[in-house]
Amino acid sequence: APRGTQAEESPFVGNPGNITGARGLTGTLRCQLQVQGEPPEVHWLRDGQILELADSTQTQVPLGEDEQDDWIVVSQLRITSLQLSDTGQYQCLVFLGHQTFVSQPGYVGLEGLPYFLEEPEDRTVAANTPFNLSCQAQGPPEPVDLLWLQDAVPLATAPGHGPQRSLHVPGLNKTSSFSCEAHNAKGVTTSRTATITVLPQQPRNLHLVSRQPTELEVAWTPGLSGIYPLTHCTLQAVLSDDGMGIQAGEPDPPEEPLTSQASVPPHQLRLGSLHPHTPYHIRVACTSSQGPSSWTHWLPVETPEGVPLGPPENISATRNGSQAFVHWQEPRAPLQGTLLGYRLAYQGQDTPEVLMDIGLRQEVTLELQGDGSVSNLTVCVAAYTAAGDGPWSLPVPLEAWRPGQAQPVHQLVKEPSTPAFSWPW
């Protein structure tokens, strides 16, 4: 029996066999040696490299009573779920005494139906928009030829004749399914079926039609939606005066947007309940039965200024001889813009009214004409922005001032219902 004591006298009495099978196969390679004395550890090589993580078991059977008698050593390497990376030449390696011995080789091969490395994926595409699908398969055996199918209909006359790894689709007008078949000498494997959902194209030309302090009217042009009519469009508006910096293509606004739905047609919508004199960003997407289009880029818009919604507050008017002292506070109601100043009007019972622009001051001293005997003198004040005057206050009568007395304050009891300009008398 071989002892492995002389140079190149192999101790191996059984060498690894050959395994050829399809992916996923489980198999075992086996080698056997007969040695004298302590049995060595058997290592496995694949293509000349020691397998660091080998699923191997070693069995040792003594052929005699003494430790120095012969031993039969069997090593088995288990290959679970055969993959391409498992293929190659396998050998057993032992270090015996001062020598290294390698068994005769066995081979592991892979042969079966094609195996997909890449399959078409589900995706959404805009109507009439080109896109690509990928499919890749390998043997062995090679060659592997691909055949693409759309809605179960082959796109070429035979495998290998049409597009192979990449299928270019110039555009779809309805939701469709795609798959690919991989053909080799062993047969055919069919990939998963990818559903390509056709969504409406992104709307175009989003623009402002008209502006009011609290309303914006916007319009857009719908994109193509294939065979699926648009059911509605959704418009979003978000405040942009806080340095939020929405970029042209930024996907999500940083705060909860104001969302409105528009029936279509017309492709137009009035957005209400907005803040006057405020920058916004708006965008629109349109939806069919298949789903929503992508959003348009954010469009910066701004509501115009309005007039103040209420009169100045806490107006006080006192008279001291030929002088009258009037002061007031800023309106509590929204200004709807930038306050530019105040207008004041005063009038006696039988005298023409006098109109003054006070600017941004909130008090004024009036020089009254004559000896101050004008009776029933009243004062009104209004705030104004670039958009115009707000409502005038109710007339406040001038009261005689007596030293030591607190100045009388006339509260505004009733605000005019309309902000339109009108003289209060």
Partner: antibody, heavy 118, light 112 residues
Framework: QVQLQQPGAELVKPGASVKLSCKAS????????INWVKQRPGQGLEWIGN????????NYNEKFKSKATLTVDKSSTTAYIQFSSLTSEDSAVYYC???????????WGQGTTLTVSS | DIVMSQSPSSLAVSAGEKVTMSCKSS????????????LAWYQQKPGQSPKLLIY???TRQSGVPDRFTGSGSGTDFTLTISSVQAEDLAVYYC????????FGGGTKLEIK
């Protein structure tokens, strides 16, 4: 009896290419790595690279990647090293050697003396 | 890449003397799977091919006189010739085969 046979000498002109051979016998040629080693006159040993005959898998010393190409012919159990664009720096003795997985026995060819001269 | 450094580059001794030469590797040469140290020593006499003396750091090749001894572990290795003979005139190289191959620069042994 394991043997690695190499021709004794080769004379080539600068700029030319040459293919040196190493004929193996006495063992299963496809089961052991063949290494190639360079030794310039009066200098040390430099490992060039190796090749596994069964799969023709190769490894190279970075220094020789663009200079040397290792191949085998399994049918004749012969390993080859091909050099391109030869210069006088390539004049050396080239040894082929069988690797026994870091152990023993260890086999070396006698070496081929390559002279690059016009 | 693993770098191998040998010292001294040359030494001259009289016959019968003991000689030691050193080889250092830039990383450990111990393979945990096979539990072998992949370090070999070669002797190259003038005009000859290199000849294996020691492998696995300390295992003497069959037929090599027992005056040659290899030792060391990890990254530091030594070749000792206990009593130098005239026929030991040669260059001695260490070689790692833990990851591909790398040779040391060699130690030239001369006899006084």
């Amino acid at each position: 009896q394991v043997q690695l046979q190499q021709p004794g000498a080769e004379l080539v002109k600068p700029g030319a290419s040459v293919k040196l051979s190493c004929k193996a016998s006495g063992y299963t040629f496809t089961s052991y790595w063949i290494n190639w080693v360079k030794q310039r006159p009066g200098q040390g040993l430099e490992w060039i690279g190796n090749i596994y005959p069964d799969s023709s898998s190769t490894n190279y010393n970075e220094k020789f990647k663009s200079k040397a190409t290792l191949t085998v012919d399994k049918s004749s159990t012969t390993a080859y090293i091909q050099f391109s664009s030869l210069t006088s720096e390539d004049s050396a003795v080239y040894y082929c050697t069988r690797d026994t997985y870091g152990g023993s026995p260890d086999y070396w060819g006698q070496g081929t003396t390559l002279t690059v001269s016009s | 890449d693993i770098v191998m450094s040998q010292s001294p580059s040359s030494l001259a001794v009289s016959a019968g003397e003991k000689v030691t030469m050193s080889c250092k590797s830039s990383q450990s040469l111990l393979n945990s799977r096979t539990r072998k140290i992949y370090l070999a020593w070669y002797q190259q006499k003038p005009g000859q091919s290199p000849k294996l003396l020691i492998y696995w750091a300390s295992t003497r090749q069959s037929g090599v006189p027992d005056r040659f001894t290899g030792s060391g572990s990890g990254t530091d290795f030594t070749l000792t010739i206990s009593s130098v003979q005239a026929e030991d005139l040669a260059v001695y190289y260490c070689k790692q085969s833990y990851n591909l191959w790398t040779f040391g620069g060699g130690t030239k042994l001369e006899i006084k």
